[in-house]
Interface confidence: low
């Protein structure tokens, strides 16, 4: 809060602007008449250093002149880079109740001369853009500092344009606001940067340049795709560019895909084939530009033409399987299941599926077409039976895949041998297998199926399956795996003609049952129990149940239980019991055991057999 | 927040002369792809024409080249498409649309890459 000077002046020699390490002298002077009232031997000026506004130093050590009552002159050193503030005030000594009285103050600037501008930069973006430059300054001068941008080309033709830098802002970088036409692409332009402070000036070297050198093209636009006679594998791709683009870059890739396919094009005019598409598949397509072959720069990537090749028929075999079931004596239901194509061979939508049976000998053909993998029919159990189906999309059908229909499991000595099946974790089963042993014919390939263990599942849900080689004897099998379920899984060996099968049950992850079987009924017959009880819910078992336990012991005893195992058998559901003593009243309950442990008990049933028991 | 409001559209007989205007606001014009597109009952619609303000292209469908001229006026935020010699054939919705956000193989006539779309014109031309 200097008001304005009213009391005196304060000046700065050589300059209020210093370089770096200079001292200056800094003399503060009473104007006539100001002053300690009719006492100018008790004026004191007194001279304060204010940094950030904050007074750092009183600087009444630093005189180096004195003139009584009326002025007094400073040196100042080791000033600090930036903007330190000087206030001159007066001290009456008389009156020493009053505060010093401000007099003038003076601002001194510390900086350093501007290093030349280096590493200049143009560019001009498109043919139609402006041309604009960047540098780099150098160190820091802590002074306002300007910058002029000076552009000159041929015929003496000049154009220049100014910025500064201060602590608020910083300049190093001007759009010249002017475009180069490609027909000045032979010329050469020189740009030059200088650099103007109150500590000095300086001027980069001067940067040489073509059109060439400067220009980078915009990013190709109106992207679009012609597929040639609607293939899906060959493509016309089609763009706009500036006129004076000679190379251009296509990249091209499916749209869940990591990698782009990379191709180079020279003078393209906007035009480029591609042969190499996969057809029914959504790609992304980017372009981009130069002006020169062997100079200038690359264009940003355009924006990006998202498209779907058209479809075209589909390739591939289909992977079918079947399960037959005799109806009555003369019947019998085929049940065909086919592997969807994965998109690669279906090369568009699957439409529908046509799907043959046919009896060998060609008597009797049934034909159909369905959307479903599967379809059910039922046919005479007399004569050879053959199946095919293909997949059809807009374009056309695949080869059909042939099955020959014979008894899956009708053949022992095709069984496959030492059937096994291990938990490999949470989502697999490990199944291994030995070849049939007295095979009379050739085993052609294995066929691994796998079924939940749950009511309803042969009606409800399809099997799922895998084709192994031959010459294969495991196979991991994941699809559609969950813990805590139990899996009948079958290996079927197949011939030509014939077919032999071996069956295990699996799980992935298993936990002893939540509960035990429920027993509904104990009858005495012929001197046996037996003992009928209910299954435990599908969800409840936690994996495949290895086998039941039925506990009994006499009513009040403390004595520990007798118990019978019984196999797992999902089809049995009652057992005789022969130990126990007539007109004895026993508590049986039963549990169920997986690979993890035993479950909890089930209900427990009191009974008193009446006959005579062993 | 964005807006497109197309004016112009009328009735006129053949072989007269139109012009649409689409005042944007919201919207600057700078860098973009701009166009009007037009339906007519029971087909899908189509591209008319386009300018991109980026590099100053304009595109024409082959039907109205020679006939139909856009431009913008920047000062303004409006968009223009003079149509002349017009034809039965003419008739339908005429649309404003601006930021061509996403490319389709069809380009600039595409009508699903335009981010902003105005309600639309009415225009007959009988014969």
């Known amino acids: 809060n200097i008001d304005v000077c009213k009391l005196g002046t304060v000046t700065v020699q050589p300059a209020p602007v210093i370089p770096l390490g200079s001292a200056a002298n800094i003399s503060c002077s009473l104007n006539p008449k100001q002053g300690c009232s009719h006492y100018p031997s008790s004026n004191e000026l007194i001279l304060l250093k204010f940094v950030n506004d904050v007074l750092v130093e009183n600087l009444h050590g630093k005189k180096v002149h004195d003139h009584t009552g009326h002025s007094s002159t400073f040196q100042v050193t080791n000033l600090s880079l930036g903007m330190t503030l000087f206030v001159c005030k007066l001290n009456c000594s008389n009156s020493q109740k009053k505060p010093p009285v401000p007099v003038c103050g003076v601002e001194i600037s510390v900086g350093v001369a501007p290093e030349p501008p280096q590493n200049i930069s143009c560019v001009q973006e498109g043919e139609n853009g402006t041309v604009a430059c960047s540098w780099n300054s150098g160190k820091v001068t802590y002074l306002k500092t300007n910058y002029t941008l000076q552009l000159s080309g041929p015929n003496n033709l000049t154009c220049q344009k100014q910025c500064f830098s201060d602590n608020r802002q910083n300049c190093n970088r001007l759009d010249l606001g002017i475009n180069l036409s490609p027909d000045l692409a032979e010329s050469r332009f020189i740009v030059r940067v200088t650099a103007i402070n109150d500590l000095g000036n300086s001027s980069s070297l001067p940067h040489t340049f073509t059109f060439l050198d400067i220009v980078i093209p915009l990013p190709p636009w109106d992207i679009r795709i012609n597929f040639l006679n609607a293939s899906g594998s060959r493509g016309t791709l089609q763009w706009e560019d500036e006129g004076q683009v000679v190379l251009n870059q296509l990249r091209y890739q499916p749209l869940n895909s990591t990698s782009w396919n990379m191709v180079n094009a020279t003078n393209a005019k906007g035009k480029y084939d591609l042969r190499d598409l996969r057809p029914f598949t959504e790609y992304e397509f980017q372009i981009s530009s130069k002006l020169h072959l062997s100079g200038g720069s690359w264009s940003n990537w355009s924006e990006s033409l998202r498209t779907r090749t058209p479809e075209e028929e589909p390739v591939g075999i289909l992977d079918i399987w079947y399960m037959k079931q005799d109806i009555d004596y003369d019947r019998q239901q085929i049940s065909l299941f086919w592997k969807s194509l994965n998109p690669s061979e279906a090369r568009g939508k699957i439409l529908h599926y046509q799907v043959t049976l046919q009896e060998v000998t060609k008597k009797t053909t049934l034909q159909n077409t369905t959307r479903h993998t599967s379809w059910t029919r039922v046919i005479p159990r007399t004569g050879a039976w053959t199946a095919s189906v293909s997949a059809a999309n807009s374009k056309g059908a695949s080869a059909p895949t042939h099955i020959n229909i014979v008894d899956l499991c009708g053949t022992g000595l095709l069984a496959p041998h030492q059937v096994s099946a291990k938990s490999e974790n949470m989502d697999n089963i490990l199944v291994t297998w030995q070849p049939p042993k007295k095979a009379d014919s050739a085993v052609r390939e294995y066929i691994v199926e796998w079924r939940a263990l749950q009511p309803g599942s042969i009606t409800k849900f399809p099997p799922h399956w895998l084709r192994i080689p031959p010459d294969n004897m495991s196979a991991l099998i994941s699809e559609n795996i969950k813990p805590y379920i139990c899996y009948e899984i079958r290996v079927h060996a197949l011939s030509e003609s014939q077919g032999g099968c071996s069956s295990i049950r699996g799980d992935s992850k298993h936990k002893a049952p939540v509960s035990g079987p429920h027993i509904t009924a104990i009858t005495e017959k012929k001197e046996r129990l037996f003992i009928s009880w209910t299954h435990i819910p599908f969800p409840e078992q936690r994996g495949c149940i290895l086998h039941y336990r039925i506990y009994w012991k006499e009513r009040d005893s403390t004595a520990q239980p007798e118990l019978c195992e019984i196999q797992y058998r999902r089809s049995q559901n009652s057992h005789p019991i022969s130990s126990l003593q007539p007109r004895v009243t026993y508590v049986l309950w039963m549990t169920a055991v997986t690979a993890a442990g035993e479950s909890p008990q089930g209900n427990e049933r009191e009974f008193c057999p009446q006959g005579k028991a062993n | 927040q964005v807006q497109l409001q197309e004016s112009g559209g009328g009735s006129v007989q053949a072989g007269g002369s139109l012009r649409l205007s689409c005042a944007v606001s919201?919207?600057?014009?700078?860098?973009?792809?701009m166009g009007w597109f037009r339906q007519a009952p029971g087909k899908e619609r189509e591209g008319v024409a386009a300018?991109?303000?980026?590099?100053?292209?304009?595109y024409y469908a082959d039907s109205v080249k020679d006939r139909f001229t856009i431009s913008k006026d920047t000062a303004k935020n409006t968009l223009y498409l003079q149509m002349n010699s017009l034809t039965p054939e003419d008739t339908g919705m005429y649309y404003c649309a601006a930021d061509l956000t996403r490319w389709y193989s069809g380009g600039w006539r595409d009508p699903r890459g335009y981010k902003y779309w105005g309600q639309g014109t009415q225009v007959t031309v009988s014969s």
């Open positions: 919201g919207y600057t014009f700078s860098n973009h792809h």
């Open positions: 300018i991109y303000t980026g590099a100053g292209n304009i």
